[in-house]
Interface confidence: medium
Amino acid sequence: GIAIPRNSGCPNSEDKNFPRTVMVNLNIHNRNTSTNPKRSSDYYNRSTSPWNLHRNEDPERYPSVIWEAKCRHLGCVKADGNVDYHMNSVPIQQEILVLRREPRHCPNSFRLEKILVSVGCTCVTPIVHHVA
Amino acid sequence: GIAIPRNSGCPNSEDKNFPRTVMVNLNIHNRNTSTNPKRSSDYYNRSTSPWNLHRNEDPERYPSVIWEAKCRHLGCVKADGNVDYHMNSVPIQQEILVLRREPRHCPNSFRLEKILVSVGCTCVTPIVHHVA
């Protein structure tokens, strides 16, 4: 974060370890200015490295529902619809921030948590290890 | 989230619209149990839909740095290294949560914000619109 002299209009922090614990307004602001951003919604079927999406729900996490990608094949789909095993379908992973209720079940106390999620799949040339 | 009679160990909320404003501990817990999860770090070069990563920094946001993917080509790279324009490289996008300082510059007060980020690229068969 940025260190700036405290604004007189800022809420006070009672935490001596400031700002380890902060106040967060959960009314989400959607920064996607376009009313219909071009989403990846049909790419999972049209990709040469197609994937399925699996629903992961955890009521102690915020957001409680995350959809995770799992590649359908080890290889990549060719134009004729067959799978080419000389190429690899691999998940594209991203670390995202979520809020985890802490202590558990407390409705207004969270801890930031980093989790690794698979967002989709891409087709890559494999790394070939040559044995001498 | 889960609604359970409030735990006596839970912090109190002074927000009448409870729990719109919550306390968040910014000491991030990393849920990626493996010390070296298999990341997508080299896929951006090896993919048939390669991408470049661009650094997006915003000191009023947490995390302040986000890396955004931009596909290198309109088409997809073939085995011979040439680009096939009968296929399309497209970004895989994901909505993620970030914290936005609110009011601006306040070190301990944030609002949740949803932003759409491009995580990587995948190669898809184009949608062909036939004109009657």
Epitope: L26, I28, Y62 | A3
Partner: antibody, heavy 123, light 106 residues
Framework: EVQLVQSGAEVKKPGASVKVSCKAS????????VHWVRQAPGQGLEWMGV????????AYNQKFEGRVTMTTDTSTSTAYMELRSLRSDDTAVYYC????????????????WGQGTLVTVSS | EIVLTQSPDFQSVTPKEKVTITCSAS?????MHWFQQKPDQSPKLWIY???NLASGVPSRFSGSGSGTDYTLTINSLEAEDAATYYC?????????FGQGTKLEIK
Amino acid sequence: EVQLVQSGAEVKKPGASVKVSCKASGYTFTDYEVHWVRQAPGQGLEWMGVIDPGTGGVAYNQKFEGRVTMTTDTSTSTAYMELRSLRSDDTAVYYCTRYSLFYGSSPYAMDYWGQGTLVTVSS
Amino acid sequence: EIVLTQSPDFQSVTPKEKVTITCSASSSVNYMHWFQQKPDQSPKLWIYRTSNLASGVPSRFSGSGSGTDYTLTINSLEAEDAATYYCQQRSSYPWTFGQGTKLEIK
């Protein structure tokens, strides 16, 4: 005002397919999943599955796997449920309902429902 | 799949009476939702996450429970409460509903 408006009643022959639509308004379509629930005449409620309009992710009740397809069109904020190889016991009212993916004041439950679409399967 | 069994199936009650509907799950669930449905209407979310009243639900309604046993209670029944009530779990796939409890006003 949140609204889920479904397509009109359908009469189908056994073996045919039906596609029910559900147009959402009054909220951000991609912030909520769309679940489909059916109710046979005089019977209880049966969950069929869910689609996330943002990712296209689907999870179906295994009972309907292979016969049902759920899709969305984010440009028109419309969800669709197609059921194939219809049988007489598929005669039911089909409901779409939304379920929040995010927080705010959301109850993490199926909080708004469409008016229902009666599908009658009869030879 | 988790089977939810409601009791009773049907109850005829006089106004001002206290009503208790139970929902028993075949396996433990983390919480329960309840829906109200009147004839020729769509279901309405009534109680969510075991004990929270949905918007517009009168305070005479309450919900409680944990594990496999959950309860919907109406403290003092009113004529407008005549309806069928369904419990619903979403702890495991497929999501399931109870068979419903029909409340009739005497």
